[in-house]
Interface confidence: low
């Protein structure tokens, strides 16, 4: 059976594999998917080795008709890189000569200067170039190699391993050699991957439940460090809680030198986050730390600085923490706006079974603000998910010179962030170089500024204007508001109408549905506009809900069903890839997030119209 | 991936001025920060001025005579050398968040 990185070369023109004869000898044959001679995958960025022999694909020379066959593989040998050219077009790095069928007299794969269709390939049983299987760097644990990644092949014992392997050992642990000669270099590492014993990679809290893996003995950038976190189904280490920090100087008490952590500020407009998206809730930095010098924008944890934190450039080496199994946020679930009848006082705002109001014109320092959102039966408002912040920004009248209060604050414990209403940090979105947390003047309290109402913490002796929030009642007669400019059974947002086509169908009935409808698929001009999507779809019980984008016209460039620009995207990790096809929006915990589907798979959808007696804006020139 | 190609570099007598150009191609969307670095024959790769957002950083070296700017819609960034001295020879390197994305570098020599 082929392994998720192994692949077939498939000519189309001839329907017709690559078969690895022997080392001298790559012809073709017919495609045989159990045959081991057929069967390549991406060892390094540029080689391709025959998973038969164990050999890399390469050429005697950079010349127009020569032979491909295999060679020992070698990393810094210019006759064996390869890379995709456009479409499927594979060829020698650098040149414009390419992996081609030969012809009716040579049976062997050439090299050579012609694109035309025997110059074209596929993995076989797929639309995909063969870079689509890429090759992924394997970082090694333990071991004498400072994590350095595996080499594929290495050669043990004077055989050669295409995979890690635990030849040598008695214990099962699997390994990999981190040169392609072990048996010279001797520098090894353990495999990230699930085996008898791995778990004892990790420390378990008992408290919590969450592991936690030290790789202090390493030298990765922090970029690298969170890709082995992430192959071993894990993340770099975020800590919300001062348990958890306490529990972690304890395990990194005996150790020096720094260790990566998941806390960066890589985001553009935002600021300090954590990689696994925790909420940046409880601060514990180094004295003089964060340091606003630009590049520093990754974290370390400093076990001989009683493990406080600074900020680092991104491309130092260092050992790195990480994290898995239960997060240690409280499980907390947020209602969906669709799910909860809301029914607000008079010039207050429903979302999603509370009610907001904006004080904007009576500033206040942030005590008196909340003493006056509790007489009003509420409090400083908390904020829990991207939609409610986005709900706040884009229908509340928020606007981007304000600066108002939120119900954050770390007056309770310094340095430790909670809601003033009582529910717990799920997620904070701070602004760039926030929280500060200047010490000369405490900033103990929290303000929502700037155009897209990111968080920055402040004195709490600042007069400003601040926003109440209040569980909505739902006692009285039940309001049926009726969405004005929109039919019955849809709903209104800005400008739009939008309805749940609730009939399982591909992308194409989708589409003729909504057209049945004097509608189309779902556009999504803005993040506004997806909150809302994600807000109307995110917690219902199927997976998927169609929307108007896919690559059908053109393969690898996506389209809306309408003619309208793309200017938005919201894509899930890993998409769109370069597999072909039609768009749908995720639910549950990826809810909103864009997918690539097949676009005969079956889903429900969404469908979108003008509003009746809505003015049409003029569209944008380009 | 990102991938960026510096230009401009070249041989100035000690006072002159030349312009450094940084073009980014790629997944440029993916650009926070951009920064200019330098090395010198056997000293360590130094960080000369980076921008993020509207904020700009120098190396106290060169505050006041270097300036740098981008020009999103050309995805390019520059870096303005003026009253250059003989110190500021190295190779100059342009760089796309903060470490992840490097150029190849180009060359400045100032003669004195």
């Known amino acids: 059976l082929l392994d998720t990185r192994q692949f077939l070369i498939y000519n189309e023109d001839h329907k017709r594999c690559v078969d690895a004869v022997s080392p001298s000898a790559v012809q073709t044959a017919a495609c045989n998917q159990d045959a081991e001679s057929q069967k390549f995958r991406w060892v390094s960025e540029s080689q391709i080795m025959s998973v038969a022999f164990k050999l890399c694909l390469g050429v005697p020379s950079k010349t127009d008709w020569v032979a491909i066959t295999l060679y020992a593989c070698d990393s810094k040998s210019e006759f064996q890189k390869w890379e995709c050219k456009n479409d499927t077009l594979l060829g020698i790095k650098g040149e414009d000569l390419f992996f081609n069928y030969g012809n009716r007299q040579e049976k062997n794969i050439m090299l050579y200067k012609g694109s035309g269709l025997w110059s074209r390939w596929k993995i076989y049983g797929t639309t995909d170039n063969l870079c689509s299987r890429g090759y992924e760097a394997m970082y090694t644990l333990l071991g004498n190699a400072n994590g350095a990644t595996c080499a594929f092949p290495f050669k043990f014992e004077n055989k050669w391993y295409a995979d890690c392997t635990s030849a040598g050992r008695s214990d099962g642990w699997l390994w990999c050699g981190t040169t392609t000669d072990y048996d010279t270099d001797k520098l090894f590492g353990y495999c990230p991957l699930k085996f008898e014993g791995s778990e004892s990679l990790w420390n378990k809290d008992p408290l919590t439940s969450v592991s936690y893996q030290i790789n202090s003995k390493s030298a990765l950038t922090w970029h690298q460090a969170r890709k082995s976190c992430q192959q071993q189904n894990a993340e770099l280490l975020s800590i919300t809680e001062i348990h958890e920090q306490t529990y972690l100087t304890g395990l990194t008490s005996s150790l020096t030198s720094g260790l990566w952590i998941g806390l960066n500020s890589l985001s553009f407009n935002s600021g300090w986050q954590w990689s696994d998206r925790s909420p940046f809730r409880y601060l514990n930095w180094l004295p003089g730390s964060p340091s606003a010098e630009p590049g520093k924008s990754c974290v370390s944890l400093n076990p001989g600085k009683n493990a406080k934190w600074e900020n680092l450039e991104c491309v130092q080496k260092l050992g790195y923490i990480c994290k898995k199994g239960n997060t240690t946020l409280n499980s907390f679930v947020i209602p969906s706006e669709s799910d909860v009848p809301t029914h607000c006082p008079s010039q207050w705002w429903p979302y999603a079974g509370h009610c907001y109001k904006i004080h904007r014109d009576e500033k206040k320092i942030q005590r008196d603000a909340l003493t006056t959102c509790r007489k009003e039966g509420g409090d400083l408002t908390s904020i829990h998910t991207i939609e409610e912040l986005d709900f706040i920004i884009s229908q509340l009248g928020y606007e981007p010179n304000d600066e108002l209060w939120i119900g954050l604050n770390d007056i309770k414990i310094q340095m430790y962030f909670e809601w003033s209403d009582g529910t717990p940090v799920t997620f904070t979105k701070w602004l760039r170089g926030e929280p500060s947390h200047e010490n000369n003047r405490q900033e103990d309290c929290v303000v929502m500024k700037g155009k897209d109402g990111y968080w920055a913490d402040r004195g709490c002796e600042w007069p400003l204007g601040y926003i109440c929030k209040m569980k909505s009642r739902s006692q009285g007669p039940e309001i049926v508001e009726v969405e004005k400019g929109c039919r019955k059974g849809w709903k209104k947002h800005h400008f739009y109408c939008y309805m749940i086509g609730h009939t399982l169908s591909t992308f194409a009935e989708a589409n003729q549905t909504c057209n049945n409808e004097n509608a189309y698929l779902t556009t999504i001009e803005d993040r506004y506009e997806q909150a809302f999507l994600t807000s109307f779809v995110g917690l219902r019980p199927e997976k998927y809900f169609w929307t108007g984008l896919s690559d059908i016209q053109t393969k690898g460039t996506f389209q809306w069903t309408i003619e309208e620009e793309v200017r938005f995207t919201h894509w899930n990790s890993d998409m769109p890839g370069r597999k072909p096809g039609c768009v749908a929006m995720r639910t549950g915990i990826a809810g909103g997030l864009w997918d690539v589907l097949k676009c005969d798979e079956k889903a429900k959808f969404v469908c979108k119209h003008w509003a009746e007696g809505v003015t049409h804006p003029p569209k944008p020139t380009t | 991936q990102v991938q960026l190609q510096e230009s401009g570099g070249g041989l100035v007598q000690a006072g002159g001025s030349l312009r450094l150009s940084c073009a980014a191609s790629g997944s440029t969307f993916s650009i926070n920060n951009m920064g200019w670095y330098r090395q010198a024959p056997g000293k360590q790769r130094e960080l000369v001025a980076g921008i993020t957002g509207g904020n700009t950083h120098y190396a106290d070296s060169v505050k006041g005579r270097f300036t740098i700017s981008r020009d999103n819609a050309k995805n390019t960034m520059y870096l303005q050398m003026n009253s250059l001295k003989p110190e500021d020879t190295a190779v100059y390197y342009c760089?796309?968040?903060?470490?992840?994305?490097w150029g190849q570098g180009t060359q400045v020599t100032v003669s004195s």
């Open positions: 760089n796309a968040n903060w470490g992840a994305y």
